[in-house]
Interface confidence: medium
């Protein structure tokens, strides 16, 4: 996971950061650009049909530390990366799906405890 450009210096992050957004664009966004006081993110996750869908957007400063932490979710494959170093920095983020569990390659029903 990347959180490039993070710094303890208060001047390191611009007051308003512009991010590329797709499927997470607020109503007031223009040309697929949103603005935030927090982070830009790009996320890859399997949709309900197992297709690896990429979305991107803005995260507010409040709570973004937690959201940018890639905590595994049971039975869901997803990965998120965040950045703050420049406008539209999330264009260059490239999160990758965590590997499939071996049980997905065994014929027969799955039994969850």
């Amino acid at each position: 996971k990347k959180e490039d450009g993070e710094s303890t210096a208060p001047t390191a992050r611009p007051k308003v950061l512009r991010c590329k957004c797709h499927h997470h664009c607020p109503e007031d966004s223009v040309n697929n650009i949103c603005s935030t006081d927090g982070y830009c993110f790009t996320m890859i996750e399997e949709d309900d049909s197992g297709t690896p869908v990429v979305t991107s957007g803005c995260l507010g400063l409040e709570g973004s530390d937690f959201q940018c932490r890639d905590t595994p979710i049971p039975h869901q494959r997803r990965s998120i990366e965040c950045c703050t170093e420049r406008n539209e920095c999330n264009k260059d983020l490239h999160p990758t799906l965590p590997p499939l569990k071996d049980r997905d390659f065994v014929d027969g029903p799955i039994h969850h405890k």
Epitope: H22, E46, G50, V53, L97, L100, D104, D107, P109, I110
Partner: antibody
């Protein structure tokens, strides 16, 4: 190894129906959705629809809603597509394709020929 | 429906060349694009997902790029086994739609 096996060819008469099969092996059948794609020579690829083998839930391309019916048989790990009221426009190669994240596997394809 | 346009139906190349196959979406699809390779008499084979992610086992001479509406599949150091049809597909919204394909031929 993930594999999708399809019969090589089907010859059917105009107006008739045909049921195409796609047998999956090498993975847990119910965890990967199955897509169906049509290919005619010089006409590129067309997405027909997809089915969730676990629930049987389907999503169709409007264009094929009255033409194709997708089903699954879980015990045999087989997905099926029934094509109805066949015309020469339905003569094509039909592929099943299974996708899960960074795995993407296509069947061998069934050539359907509609001819009297 | 989203239309995927591959304006070049044929592209001529030589072994060792670098070639770029392009695909244009009729509306913004983010990076939700697949690239497929198809050889005569064979099923399509997935090369790239999410516009730039290479499937495992795909040689690193295949590179996908682009976002929004413009996408490119670049093959550097073309090999004779790369001569095939290449299709893009968007999966940002239903129905999923494909480009008409670009045939890569030997010059």
């Amino acid at each position: 190894q993930v594999q999708l096996q399809q019969p090589g060819a089907e010859l059917v008469k105009p107006g008739a129906s045909v049921k195409l099969s796609c047998k999956a092996s090498g993975y847990t059948f119910t965890t990967y959705w199955m897509h169906w794609v049509k290919q005619r020579p010089g006409r590129g690829l067309e997405w027909i629809g997809r089915i969730d083998p676990n629930s049987g839930g389907t999503k169709y391309n409007e264009k094929f809603k009255s033409k194709a019916t997708l089903t699954v048989d879980k015990p045999s790990s087989t997905a099926c597509m029934q094509l109805s009221s066949l015309t020469s426009e339905d003569s094509a190669v039909y592929y099943c394709a299974s996708r899960r994240g960074d795995i993407d596997v296509w069947g061998t394809g069934t050539t359907v020929t509609v001819s009297s | 429906d989203i239309v995927m346009t591959q304006s070049q139906k044929f592209m001529s190349t030589s072994v060792g060349d670098r070639v770029s196959v392009t695909c244009k979406a009729s509306q913004n699809v983010g990076t939700n694009v697949f690239w497929y390779q198809q050889k005569p008499g064979q099923s399509p084979k997935a090369l790239i997902y999410a516009a730039s992610y290479r499937y495992s086992g795909v040689p690193d001479r295949f590179t996908g790029s682009g976002s929004g509406t413009d996408f490119t599949l670049t093959i550097s150091n073309v090999q004779s086994e790369d001569l095939a049809d290449y299709f893009c597909q968007q999966y940002d919204s239903y129905p999923l739609t494909f480009g008409d394909g670009t045939k890569l031929e030997l010059r």
